[in-house]
């Protein structure tokens, strides 16, 4: 007889998710030399453990906490990068701009990034059929309990001047619900980041509006000063030729406005 | 410590093979084992690493073709060099650790001269 | 491949005095600059990693600084000693097609008086 299995809203683990995790770990170590005292072994045995056997709708921070032990990495504290609803253009910048960070450029980011993953209470099977929606289903599911771990862990890290990258195209440039609006926003510490500095991505060629004006900039500029730190805002009207230009500094057409 | 060996007199157009023996280590753990060259009274110039952890292999561009790069055993590396030319003249060094070569061996003069 | 660019080639000071080479890098490299001292004859020997980190035995007078493109090594209270050949070493990497490359500097000499 068939076990009946419990049916979420959301898609399965992502196949061969074993497997994915422990390769991008062996990866992650050989290009990042300092990061070779990690046993990838003993990290996927820490990932695996943060949610096998367990109900995937009643994850804490606290089942993640042998994974964030063993993860543990410094970046220079004042070259991070947030982002939110833009993270492709942010992995392009830090991948030019090799001194700045965003979360998926550490160890435990990069092993999560784009992955969906969920056991089923008292088996320790991974479920490759559905795993729990954050709307649809509940908020303390395996994947968004991760996020909000190391998110908040990241933010928290963070010192001097704090860039962010928004993108300047959707109806909410800031959204208070996602994870840089609800978790690293308010998970900054005052006493060490001076400002933080939000980037609005352009989406139209001809668009030449100060989208640093826009409602809900002045509200994360609102939230910011509450806490005690300064904002600072800049358009950036043309995404490609910012990458060009972070690429070649040095280029005459550099020195306009981007 | 690291010990090159193999070097030598050869003729344009030969092939040869160094190698690289690590003694008070081994390379079962993942380590970066690098070639580098320097010709007479000229600089550094890097050719080629292998990541013993994985095996992955990676080279300057001017090298790729005509050298290769293995691991041979747990504390052995090669360098296969073909179809040499006068300009590869120059003491071969063995180096290893990360993004860094903490570690150097000797060094090993290969000669190409008719 | 990325070019690092060395200078001067050569600079020449006196005992007690203060030594500065240059490295630039034709890419942003973040961090991962080393310098290397080299004497005649013998092996390069690591002074500096990860752009000022202090390799092992190595004296406090070697101070390495910088970060992204342009990274440089002072070498203060100059000794006689320190008379040999300087090279800075980058390492690059990119995670998408898996590319690692190390590349060398032409070299500084540092001739002491």
């Known amino acids: 007889v068939p076990r009946w299995r419990q049916q979420w809203s959301g898609p399965g683990t992502t196949k061969r998710f074993p497997e994915t995790v422990l390769a991008r770990c062996v990866k992650y170590t050989e290009i990042h030399p300092e990061m070779r005292h990690v046993d990838c072994q003993s990290v996927w045995d820490a990932f695996k453990g943060a949610f096998i056997s367990k109900h995937p709708c009643n994850i804490t921070e606290e089942d993640y906490q042998p994974l964030m032990k063993l993860g543990t990495q410094t970046v220079p504290c004042n070259k991070i990068l947030l982002w939110s609803r833009i993270k492709d253009l942010a992995h392009q910048f830090t991948q030019v701009q090799r001194d700045m960070f965003t979360l998926e450029d550490t160890l435990l980011g990069y092993l999560a990034d784009d992955l969906t993953w969920c056991g089923e209470f008292n088996t320790s099977k991974i479920n490759y059929q559905s795993c729990p929606d954050w709307r649809k289903d509940c908020s303390n599911n395996p994947v968004s309990v991760f996020w909000k771990t190391v998110s908040r862990r990241f933010a928290e890290a963070a010192c001097d001047v704090v860039h962010v990258m928004l993108n300047g195209s959707r109806s909410k440039i800031f959204d208070k619900n996602s994870t840089f609006g609800s978790v690293e926003v308010h998970n900054l510490q005052p006493e060490k980041v001076q400002t933080l500095e939000a980037w609005v991505i352009h989406g139209g060629r001809e668009d030449s509006r100060d989208l640093c004006q826009d409602p809900t900039i002045k509200e994360l500029e609102s939230i910011i000063s509450k806490r005690n730190i300064q904002f600072s805002c800049k358009n950036i009207y043309r995404p490609d030729k910012f990458l060009q230009c972070v690429k070649n500094p040095e280029d005459s057409s550099c020195t306009s406005e981007i | 410590s690291l010990e090159e060996s193999g070097g030598g007199l050869v003729k344009p157009g030969a092939s040869l093979t160094l190698t690289c023996k690590a003694s008070?280590?081994?390379?079962?753990?993942?380590?970066?084992m690098c070639w580098v060259r320097q010709a007479p009274g000229k600089g550094l110039e890097w050719i080629s690493c292998i990541y013993t952890g994985s095996g992955s292999t990676y080279y300057a561009n001017w090298a790729k073709g005509r050298f290769t790069i293995s691991r041979t055993s747990s504390t052995t590396v090669t360098l296969q060099m073909t179809s040499l030319t006068a300009a590869d003249t120059a003491t071969y060094f063995c180096?290893?650790?990360?993004?860094?070569?903490?570690?150097w061996g000797p060094g090993t003069l290969v000669t190409v001269s008719s | 491949d990325i070019v690092m660019t060395q200078t001067p080639s050569s600079v020449e000071a006196a005992v007690g005095g203060t030594v500065t080479i240059k490295c630039q890098a034709s890419q942003n490299i973040g961090n991962y600059l080393a310098w290397y001292q080299q004497k005649p004859g013998q092996p390069p020997k690591v002074l500096i990693y990860?752009?000022?980190t202090l390799a092992s035995g190595v004296p406090s007078r070697f101070k390495g600084s910088g970060s992204g493109t342009h990274f440089t090594l002072t070498i203060s209270d100059l000794e006689s000693a320190d008379a040999a050949t300087y090279y800075c070493q980058s390492y690059y990497y990119t995670t998408d097609d898996n590319y690692r490359s190390w590349a060398f500097g032409g070299g500084t000499e540092v001739v002491v008086k």
């Open positions: 008070g280590f081994s390379f079962s753990s993942g380590c970066d």
């Open positions: 180096a290893g650790d990360s993004d860094y070569l903490g570690l």
């Open positions: 990860r752009a000022s």
